[in-house]
Protein backbone atom coordinates (compact mmCIF):
# COMPACT_ATOMS: atom_id res chain seq x y z
CA UNK A 1 0.00 0.00 0.00
CA UNK A 2 1.27 3.45 -0.93
CA UNK A 3 1.15 5.67 2.15
CA UNK A 4 3.51 8.43 1.08
CA UNK A 5 2.67 11.96 0.03
CA UNK A 6 4.57 14.44 -2.09
CA UNK A 7 4.87 18.00 -0.85
CA UNK A 8 5.82 20.57 -3.48
CA UNK A 9 6.28 24.31 -3.71
CA UNK A 10 2.94 24.40 -5.59
CA UNK A 11 2.39 27.41 -7.84
CA UNK A 12 5.42 29.64 -8.11
CA UNK A 13 6.49 32.63 -10.17
CA UNK A 14 9.87 33.99 -11.15
CA UNK A 15 11.35 36.74 -13.28
CA UNK A 16 12.50 36.26 -16.84
CA UNK A 17 16.29 35.87 -16.83
CA UNK A 18 16.30 34.75 -13.22
CA UNK A 19 16.43 31.31 -11.66
CA UNK A 20 14.10 29.14 -9.63
CA UNK A 21 14.45 26.07 -7.42
CA UNK A 22 12.02 23.27 -8.13
CA UNK A 23 11.64 21.25 -4.96
CA UNK A 24 9.58 18.24 -3.90
CA UNK A 25 9.63 16.22 -0.72
CA UNK A 26 8.33 12.71 -0.16
CA UNK A 27 7.00 12.06 3.33
CA UNK A 28 4.89 9.57 5.33
CA UNK A 29 6.60 6.51 3.89
CA UNK A 30 9.64 4.42 4.72
CA UNK A 31 10.05 3.45 1.04
CA UNK A 32 13.51 3.83 -0.41
CA UNK A 33 13.84 6.49 -3.13
CA UNK A 34 15.73 4.90 -6.02
CA UNK A 35 15.35 7.69 -8.57
CA UNK A 36 13.75 11.09 -9.07
CA UNK A 37 12.83 12.27 -12.57
CA UNK A 38 12.11 15.91 -13.31
CA UNK A 39 9.89 16.39 -16.34
CA UNK A 40 8.03 19.15 -18.16
CA UNK A 41 5.14 17.60 -20.05
CA UNK A 42 6.72 14.41 -21.41
CA UNK A 43 10.10 16.05 -21.76
CA UNK A 44 12.98 15.09 -19.48
CA UNK A 45 14.81 17.84 -17.62
CA UNK A 46 16.97 15.73 -15.34
CA UNK A 47 17.23 12.52 -13.39
CA UNK A 48 18.79 11.91 -10.00
CA UNK A 49 19.47 8.20 -9.53
CA UNK A 50 20.44 6.95 -6.06
CA UNK A 51 23.34 4.88 -7.43
CA UNK A 52 24.35 6.76 -10.57
CA UNK A 53 23.89 10.40 -9.58
CA UNK A 54 22.61 13.11 -11.91
CA UNK A 55 21.88 13.09 -15.63
CA UNK A 56 20.80 16.36 -17.25
CA UNK A 57 18.87 16.26 -20.53
CA UNK A 58 20.76 17.74 -23.50
CA UNK A 59 17.97 20.29 -23.91
CA UNK A 60 18.68 21.74 -20.46
CA UNK A 61 22.36 21.00 -19.88
CA UNK A 62 23.39 24.65 -20.14
CA UNK A 63 20.83 26.04 -17.72
CA UNK A 64 19.89 23.39 -15.22
CA UNK A 65 21.90 22.80 -12.05
CA UNK A 66 21.37 19.72 -9.90
CA UNK A 67 20.07 20.31 -6.40
CA UNK A 68 19.68 21.39 -3.75
CA UNK A 69 19.15 17.79 -2.64
CA UNK A 70 16.81 16.03 -5.02
CA UNK A 71 15.56 19.38 -6.31
CA UNK A 72 16.52 21.19 -9.46
CA UNK A 73 17.64 24.75 -10.15
CA UNK A 74 16.40 26.15 -13.46
CA UNK A 75 18.41 29.14 -14.64
CA UNK A 76 18.18 31.85 -17.33
CA UNK A 77 14.39 31.60 -17.31
CA UNK A 78 12.37 32.52 -20.38
CA UNK A 79 8.62 33.01 -20.78
CA UNK A 80 8.60 29.65 -22.60
CA UNK A 81 9.51 27.98 -19.30
CA UNK A 82 6.05 28.77 -17.98
CA UNK A 83 4.10 25.58 -17.38
CA UNK A 84 3.77 22.41 -15.35
CA UNK A 85 6.75 20.57 -13.93
CA UNK A 86 6.62 17.12 -12.41
CA UNK A 87 8.84 15.38 -9.89
CA UNK A 88 8.47 11.63 -10.27
CA UNK A 89 9.76 9.63 -7.31
CA UNK A 90 10.62 6.00 -8.06
CA UNK A 91 10.55 4.14 -4.75
CA UNK A 92 10.92 0.62 -3.45
CA UNK A 93 8.69 -1.09 -2.55
CA UNK A 94 5.90 1.50 -2.93
CA UNK A 95 6.26 2.34 -6.62
CA UNK A 96 5.95 5.77 -8.21
CA UNK A 97 4.83 9.05 -6.62
CA UNK A 98 4.31 12.19 -8.70
CA UNK A 99 4.29 15.82 -7.57
CA UNK A 100 3.27 18.85 -9.64
CA UNK A 101 4.62 22.39 -9.66
CA UNK A 102 3.27 25.20 -11.82
CA UNK A 103 5.85 27.80 -12.76
CA UNK A 104 4.94 31.17 -14.23
CA UNK A 105 7.80 33.20 -15.68
CA UNK A 106 7.02 36.90 -15.69
CA UNK A 107 8.54 39.83 -17.51
CA UNK A 108 10.78 41.65 -15.04
CA UNK A 109 8.58 44.76 -14.85
CA UNK A 110 5.46 42.64 -14.23
CA UNK A 111 7.17 40.71 -11.45
CA UNK A 112 8.37 43.95 -9.84
CA UNK A 113 4.90 45.44 -10.17
CA UNK A 114 3.35 42.39 -8.52
CA UNK A 115 5.81 42.53 -5.67
CA UNK A 116 5.14 46.21 -5.05
CA UNK A 117 1.37 45.86 -4.88
CA UNK A 118 0.89 42.77 -2.74
CA UNK A 119 -2.40 42.52 -0.88
CA UNK A 120 -1.69 42.58 2.84
Amino acid sequence: MMTGTIETTGNISAEKGGSIILQCHLSSTTAQVTQVNWEQQDQLLAICNADLGWHISPSFKDRVAPGPGLGLTLQSLTVNDTGEYFCIYHTYPDGTYTGRIFLEVLESSVAEHGARFQIP
Epitope: T34, Q35, L44, I47, L52, H55, P58, S59, K61, D62
Partner: antibody, heavy 120, light 107 residues
Framework: QVQLQQSGGEVMKPGASVKISCKAT????????IEWVKQRPGHGLEWIGE????????YYNEKFRGKATFTADKSSNTAYMQLSSLTSEDSAVYYC?????????????WGQGTTLTVSS | DIQMTQTTSSLSASLGDRVTISCSAS??????LNWYQQKPDGTVTLLIY???SLHSGVPSRFSGSGSGTDYSLTISNLEPEDIATYYC?????????FGGGTKLEIK
Amino acid sequence: QVQLQQSGGEVMKPGASVKISCKATGYTFSNYWIEWVKQRPGHGLEWIGEILPVSGSAYYNEKFRGKATFTADKSSNTAYMQLSSLTSEDSAVYYCARQKYGNYYYFDYWGQGTTLTVSS
Amino acid sequence: DIQMTQTTSSLSASLGDRVTISCSASQGISNYLNWYQQKPDGTVTLLIYYTSSLHSGVPSRFSGSGSGTDYSLTISNLEPEDIATYYCQHYSKLPYTFGGGTKLEIK
Protein backbone atom coordinates in the same frame (compact mmCIF):
# COMPACT_ATOMS: atom_id res chain seq x y z
CA GLN B 1 34.33 -6.47 -24.89
CA VAL B 2 31.23 -4.32 -25.26
CA GLN B 3 28.61 -5.82 -27.55
CA LEU B 4 25.02 -4.98 -28.41
CA GLN B 5 23.52 -8.00 -30.14
CA GLN B 6 20.25 -7.33 -31.94
CA SER B 7 17.57 -9.78 -32.99
CA GLY B 8 17.34 -10.96 -36.58
CA GLY B 9 15.46 -9.40 -39.48
CA GLU B 10 11.67 -9.48 -39.58
CA VAL B 11 9.09 -9.47 -42.36
CA MET B 12 5.73 -8.27 -41.08
CA LYS B 13 2.27 -7.50 -42.47
CA PRO B 14 0.84 -3.96 -42.38
CA GLY B 15 -1.08 -3.34 -39.14
CA ALA B 16 0.96 -5.87 -37.15
CA SER B 17 3.38 -5.20 -34.28
CA VAL B 18 6.98 -6.28 -33.92
CA LYS B 19 9.38 -6.41 -30.97
CA ILE B 20 13.11 -5.96 -31.61
CA SER B 21 15.64 -6.96 -28.95
CA CYS B 22 19.09 -5.66 -28.06
CA LYS B 23 21.17 -7.78 -25.69
CA ALA B 24 24.04 -5.99 -23.95
CA THR B 25 27.21 -7.74 -22.85
CA GLY B 26 30.66 -6.63 -21.67
CA TYR B 27 29.58 -3.69 -19.50
CA THR B 28 27.31 -2.71 -16.60
CA PHE B 29 23.89 -2.49 -18.24
CA SER B 30 22.49 -0.19 -15.53
CA ASN B 31 25.08 2.54 -16.10
CA TYR B 32 23.97 3.36 -19.63
CA TRP B 33 20.96 4.51 -21.59
CA ILE B 34 19.90 2.40 -24.56
CA GLU B 35 19.21 4.56 -27.60
CA TRP B 36 17.18 3.52 -30.64
CA VAL B 37 17.85 4.84 -34.14
CA LYS B 38 16.02 4.28 -37.45
CA GLN B 39 17.68 4.22 -40.85
CA ARG B 40 15.72 4.29 -44.09
CA PRO B 41 17.38 4.61 -47.50
CA GLY B 42 17.35 8.25 -48.48
CA HIS B 43 16.23 9.34 -45.01
CA GLY B 44 19.51 9.03 -43.12
CA LEU B 45 19.54 8.29 -39.39
CA GLU B 46 16.67 9.28 -37.10
CA TRP B 47 16.72 9.17 -33.31
CA ILE B 48 13.63 7.36 -31.99
CA GLY B 49 14.25 7.70 -28.27
CA GLU B 50 15.94 6.17 -25.25
CA ILE B 51 15.39 4.08 -22.15
CA LEU B 52 17.28 3.96 -18.86
CA PRO B 53 17.19 0.25 -17.97
CA VAL B 54 17.90 0.75 -14.26
CA SER B 55 14.49 2.40 -13.78
CA GLY B 56 12.61 1.86 -17.04
CA SER B 57 12.39 5.62 -17.66
CA ALA B 58 11.81 6.11 -21.38
CA TYR B 59 11.74 9.22 -23.54
CA TYR B 60 10.68 9.49 -27.16
CA ASN B 61 11.22 11.69 -30.16
CA GLU B 62 7.78 13.28 -30.62
CA LYS B 63 7.70 11.90 -34.15
CA PHE B 64 7.74 8.33 -32.83
CA ARG B 65 5.49 8.73 -29.79
CA GLY B 66 2.73 6.15 -30.07
CA LYS B 67 4.67 4.19 -32.67
CA ALA B 68 7.56 2.93 -30.53
CA THR B 69 7.52 1.56 -26.98
CA PHE B 70 10.70 0.77 -25.07
CA THR B 71 11.16 -1.77 -22.30
CA ALA B 72 14.18 -3.32 -20.64
CA ASP B 73 14.83 -6.50 -18.69
CA LYS B 74 17.63 -5.99 -16.17
CA SER B 75 17.88 -9.70 -15.41
CA SER B 76 18.87 -10.56 -18.98
CA ASN B 77 20.56 -7.23 -19.85
CA THR B 78 18.20 -6.86 -22.79
CA ALA B 79 16.36 -3.83 -24.13
CA TYR B 80 13.35 -4.07 -26.40
CA MET B 81 11.59 -1.78 -28.83
CA GLN B 82 8.05 -2.58 -29.92
CA LEU B 83 6.72 -0.95 -33.07
CA SER B 84 2.96 -1.00 -33.52
CA SER B 85 0.45 -0.50 -36.37
CA LEU B 86 3.15 -1.16 -38.92
CA THR B 87 3.09 0.49 -42.33
CA SER B 88 5.54 0.52 -45.24
CA GLU B 89 7.03 3.69 -43.71
CA ASP B 90 8.32 1.53 -40.85
CA SER B 91 10.42 -0.59 -43.21
CA ALA B 92 13.96 0.28 -42.17
CA VAL B 93 17.06 -0.86 -40.34
CA TYR B 94 16.77 -0.24 -36.61
CA TYR B 95 19.83 0.17 -34.40
CA CYS B 96 20.26 0.16 -30.66
CA ALA B 97 23.22 2.01 -29.17
CA ARG B 98 24.38 2.88 -25.69
CA GLN B 99 24.94 6.27 -24.07
CA LYS B 100 26.60 6.56 -20.67
CA TYR B 101 24.43 7.88 -17.86
CA GLY B 102 25.52 11.31 -16.70
CA ASN B 103 26.47 14.13 -18.99
CA TYR B 104 27.79 11.99 -21.84
CA TYR B 105 25.91 12.79 -25.01
CA TYR B 106 27.30 10.35 -27.56
CA PHE B 107 26.50 6.82 -28.65
CA ASP B 108 29.77 4.98 -28.17
CA TYR B 109 28.74 1.44 -29.18
CA TRP B 110 26.07 0.33 -31.62
CA GLY B 111 24.28 -2.91 -32.38
CA GLN B 112 24.59 -4.48 -35.82
CA GLY B 113 21.09 -3.39 -36.84
CA THR B 114 17.81 -5.21 -37.37
CA THR B 115 16.13 -5.03 -40.77
CA LEU B 116 12.35 -4.71 -40.67
CA THR B 117 10.37 -5.19 -43.86
CA VAL B 118 6.66 -4.38 -43.84
CA SER B 119 4.89 -5.91 -46.80
CA SER B 120 1.53 -7.42 -47.59
CA ASP C 1 14.10 20.53 -34.46
CA ILE C 2 17.64 21.46 -35.45
CA GLN C 3 18.42 20.45 -39.04
CA MET C 4 21.87 19.08 -39.81
CA THR C 5 23.05 19.39 -43.41
CA GLN C 6 25.91 17.57 -45.10
CA THR C 7 25.95 19.26 -48.48
CA THR C 8 28.30 16.73 -50.07
CA SER C 9 26.47 13.41 -50.28
CA SER C 10 29.37 11.58 -51.91
CA LEU C 11 33.06 12.23 -52.18
CA SER C 12 35.81 10.50 -54.17
CA ALA C 13 39.43 10.62 -53.03
CA SER C 14 42.71 8.77 -53.48
CA LEU C 15 44.55 6.74 -50.86
CA GLY C 16 46.85 9.02 -48.86
CA ASP C 17 44.70 12.10 -49.52
CA ARG C 18 43.59 14.55 -46.89
CA VAL C 19 39.78 14.55 -46.92
CA THR C 20 37.45 17.04 -45.24
CA ILE C 21 33.74 16.38 -44.72
CA SER C 22 31.54 19.28 -43.70
CA CYS C 23 28.35 19.59 -41.71
CA SER C 24 26.22 22.62 -40.91
CA ALA C 25 23.49 23.16 -38.34
CA SER C 26 20.34 25.24 -38.82
CA GLN C 27 21.29 27.17 -35.66
CA GLY C 28 24.29 27.44 -33.37
CA ILE C 29 24.98 24.22 -31.50
CA SER C 30 27.87 25.34 -29.25
CA ASN C 31 30.25 22.55 -30.35
CA TYR C 32 27.74 19.89 -29.28
CA LEU C 33 28.54 17.70 -32.26
CA ASN C 34 29.53 14.07 -32.80
CA TRP C 35 30.77 12.18 -35.87
CA TYR C 36 29.99 8.55 -36.72
CA GLN C 37 31.29 6.17 -39.37
CA GLN C 38 29.05 3.59 -41.04
CA LYS C 39 30.83 0.85 -42.96
CA PRO C 40 29.24 -0.73 -46.09
CA ASP C 41 28.17 -3.72 -43.95
CA GLY C 42 26.14 -1.39 -41.71
CA THR C 43 28.53 -1.31 -38.75
CA VAL C 44 28.37 2.07 -36.98
CA THR C 45 31.17 3.44 -34.81
CA LEU C 46 31.71 6.69 -32.92
CA LEU C 47 34.72 8.66 -34.18
CA ILE C 48 34.57 12.11 -32.60
CA TYR C 49 32.51 13.64 -29.80
CA TYR C 50 32.14 17.25 -28.65
CA THR C 51 33.43 18.52 -32.03
CA SER C 52 37.06 17.46 -31.62
CA SER C 53 37.50 14.76 -28.95
CA LEU C 54 38.74 11.49 -30.42
CA HIS C 55 36.89 8.41 -29.17
CA SER C 56 39.13 5.72 -27.70
CA GLY C 57 40.55 3.33 -30.27
CA VAL C 58 39.96 5.69 -33.20
CA PRO C 59 43.09 6.33 -35.34
CA SER C 60 44.67 9.75 -34.90
CA ARG C 61 44.33 10.49 -38.62
CA PHE C 62 40.71 11.45 -37.79
CA SER C 63 40.15 14.92 -36.38
CA GLY C 64 37.22 17.27 -35.93
CA SER C 65 36.83 21.02 -35.76
CA GLY C 66 34.28 23.80 -36.04
CA SER C 67 32.14 26.21 -34.07
CA GLY C 68 28.78 27.93 -34.22
CA THR C 69 26.89 26.30 -37.09
CA ASP C 70 29.78 24.93 -39.18
CA TYR C 71 31.74 21.78 -38.42
CA SER C 72 34.09 19.43 -40.23
CA LEU C 73 35.68 16.01 -40.00
CA THR C 74 39.15 15.57 -41.49
CA ILE C 75 40.90 12.34 -42.43
CA SER C 76 44.56 13.26 -42.83
CA ASN C 77 45.87 10.23 -44.71
CA LEU C 78 43.12 8.21 -46.36
CA GLU C 79 43.35 4.45 -45.92
CA PRO C 80 41.31 1.68 -47.60
CA GLU C 81 39.38 0.90 -44.41
CA ASP C 82 38.07 4.50 -44.32
CA ILE C 83 35.66 3.73 -47.15
CA ALA C 84 32.35 4.38 -45.40
CA THR C 85 29.55 6.89 -44.94
CA TYR C 86 30.13 9.59 -42.33
CA TYR C 87 27.36 11.21 -40.29
CA CYS C 88 27.37 14.24 -38.02
CA GLN C 89 24.94 14.42 -35.09
CA HIS C 90 24.16 17.32 -32.78
CA TYR C 91 23.19 17.09 -29.13
CA SER C 92 22.39 20.72 -28.48
CA LYS C 93 18.87 19.72 -27.50
CA LEU C 94 16.44 16.87 -28.03
CA PRO C 95 15.61 15.39 -30.41
CA TYR C 96 19.09 14.45 -31.50
CA THR C 97 19.32 14.81 -35.28
CA PHE C 98 21.83 13.53 -37.81
CA GLY C 99 23.15 14.87 -41.07
CA GLY C 100 22.21 13.05 -44.27
CA GLY C 101 25.63 11.43 -44.52
CA THR C 102 28.65 11.75 -46.81
CA LYS C 103 29.69 8.60 -48.66
CA LEU C 104 33.44 8.39 -49.14
CA GLU C 105 34.77 6.38 -52.09
CA ILE C 106 38.22 5.62 -53.46
CA LYS C 107 39.21 7.05 -56.85
